[in-house]
Amino acid sequence: KNLKSPQKVEVDIIDDNFILRWNRSDESVGNVTFSFDYQKTGMDNWIKLSGCQNITSTKCNFSSLKLNVYEEIKLRIRAEKENTSSWYEVDSFTPFRKAQIGPPEVHLEAEDKAIVIHISPGTKDSVMWALDGLSFTYSLVIWKNSSGVEERIENIYSRHKIYKLSPETTYCLKVKAALLTSWKIGVYSPVHCIKTTVENELPPPENIEVSVQNQNYVLKWDYTYANMTFQVQWLHAFLKRNPGNHLYKWKQIPDCENVKTTQCVFPQNVFQKGIYLLRVQASDGNNTSFWSEEIKFDTEIQAFLLPPVFNIRSLSDSFHIYIGAPKQSGNTPVIQDYPLIYEIIFWENTSNAERKIIEKKTDVTVPNLKPLTVYCVKARAHTMDEKLNKSSVFSDAVCEKTKPGNTSK
């Protein structure tokens, strides 16, 4: 009886694993084996595919074959018993184009209200992604084990920290890789779960802000308790993108080591131009907090984020404030080509009760003022990128008297 050639050959490539699957054409014929040949582009001869010769099952692995993953190859298969079937040719393909990114490896560390996720490619020193290893980004899905409500986090790198979690709570997550340059989305990792720890006695510092004063940076933060010492560390932000490196060498800011106030001042020349991450830790001598959330600090934006200038037009029950570009020395306006948001603080001159308005517009109305009353106004600018979280210092306060009644029109 003539053997029929196998059909429906599928090539699955995940990372550096090359798997072939096919259907038997004739289930009734026993003791059939299958063999593959391959042919590279521009070659006439067929070569036996090692790992896929005389196979009794309908699956084989040819990962050991050292192929150029960017070069098109063609495969053919036949069935063998006493005689052989005709060859069945598989559509030619380029391994790199066909390849899927496998599930990444995930390593978790827990704090009381945070989880640190270390992600690395599932295949170490992969041939398939050798030229793209630096381009991997990851996304994850995380949920509380008890609720199952999922949150997605996109575009993260090989180390990511998730904050604002609940203590003593089990969180589960899965991660997948992507190569955006090649439009490839990977396969999710298995689900990993970890329980956050009991709440630490000392919370981490919060609301870290950097501003510029004279030739210095001023770093400020909030803290719950008094009589603490703090230390501040920095890291080049680009190191977060290094896929093979989970060992981050955070550096001390010398003027911010063991400070006893919730701020520290250090010269601008501590940092060269660039983007940095900053973090703060608190200690009371016996206990040490976990590190604060890391804030992004861009020296370029920081250096040029000057307080806004503004004019006030006074009415009886309101001020109209017109915000303009800040002036450099020499009275030339500074061009700030990133979106800003303005925080305007105003108060009655005879009172300490401040009120605040936050506006994206450069013309702002301050309503509900009393006639013939002196009010003071100060303003500062913030970048709208939450991660950068940059703020200028406040402008000098400007005080104006509202007009007498009935001039609000």
């Epitope: 560390e109 060992l247 830790q281």
Partner: antibody, heavy 119, light 107 residues
Framework: EVQLQQSGAEFVKPGASVKLSCTAS????????IHWVTQKTEQGLEWIGR????????KYAPKFQDKATITADSSSNTAYLQLSSLTSVDTAVYFC????????????WGQGTLVSVSA | DIVMTQSQKFMSTSVGDRVSVTCKAR??????VAWYQQKPGQSPKALIY???YRYNGVPDRFTGSGSGTDFTLTISNVQSEDLADYFC?????????FGGGTKLEIK
């Protein structure tokens, strides 16, 4: 293969100083922190401090701040521990170690150097 | 400094048994804890890091668990070659600190 090779045993008199070396192979010390840990006979392990050989930045346990000085020479891929004003209390084995791919723990250790202080 | 306390200085067990070595931190250290094995005259060897991750080549009879302040190294199906000192270590913050050690003796 990652290896840390430490210098040989030192027998010194009280008041003297000693400089121990730890030569790395299989990796570049500039890429990792190198730590020093001490252990007295039949006792536990104590962390002395660490160095970042890339820029020489050091951290010490308060107890060893005035006793130990850690340095590194990237060109010879070697870290050093200098111990000063030695007394019999400083008699111990001193280990160098290297962090893994995650900060803070030590998968790689040198074989240890015995420092014996005796009149 | 964060004190790490291994309350049992000695533990006696038999081949095939299961034994748990415990370690308590004076404050929460998250899961930033490692375990080491040290045999007489040798350097310490890493067994566990990040509380529960087994280091390469470590037999799966060694498992780590716990979080916050209480940590455990469990050796199931104890073998004669497991006779050694076992140390925990925190790396939540400097100065890094070790427990005093637990000597495992085989009956």
């Amino acid at each position: 293969e990652v290896q840390l090779q430490q210098s040989g045993a030192e027998f010194v008199k009280p008041g003297a100083s000693v400089k121990l070396s730890c030569t790395a192979s299989g990796f570049n010390i500039k890429d990792y922190y190198i730590h020093w840990v001490t252990q007295k006979t039949e006792q536990g392990l104590e962390w002395i401090g660490r160095i970042d050989p890339e820029d020489g930045e050091t951290k010490y346990a308060p107890k060893f701040q005035d006793k130990a000085t850690i340095t590194a020479d990237s060109s010879s891929n070697t870290a050093y521990l200098q111990l000063s004003s030695l007394t019999s209390v400083d008699t111990a084995v001193y280990f160098c170690s290297r962090e893994g791919s995650f900060t803070g723990w030590f998968p790689y250790w040198g074989q240890g150097t015995l420092v014996s202080v005796s009149a | 400094d964060i004190v790490m306390t291994q309350s049992q200085k000695f533990m006696s067990t038999s081949v095939g048994d299961r034994v748990s070595v415990t370690c308590k931190a004076r404050q929460s250290v998250g899961t930033y804890v490692a375990w080491y094995q040290q045999k007489p005259g040798q350097s310490p060897k890493a067994l566990i890091y990040s509380t529960s991750y087994r280091y390469n080549g470590v037999p799966d009879r060694f498992t780590g668990s716990g979080s916050g302040t209480d940590f455990t190294l469990t050796i199931s199906n104890v073998q004669s070659e497991d006779l050694a000192d076992y140390f925990c270590q925190q790396y939540h913050s400097y100065p890094y600190t070790f427990g005093g050690g637990t000597k495992l003796e085989i009956k």
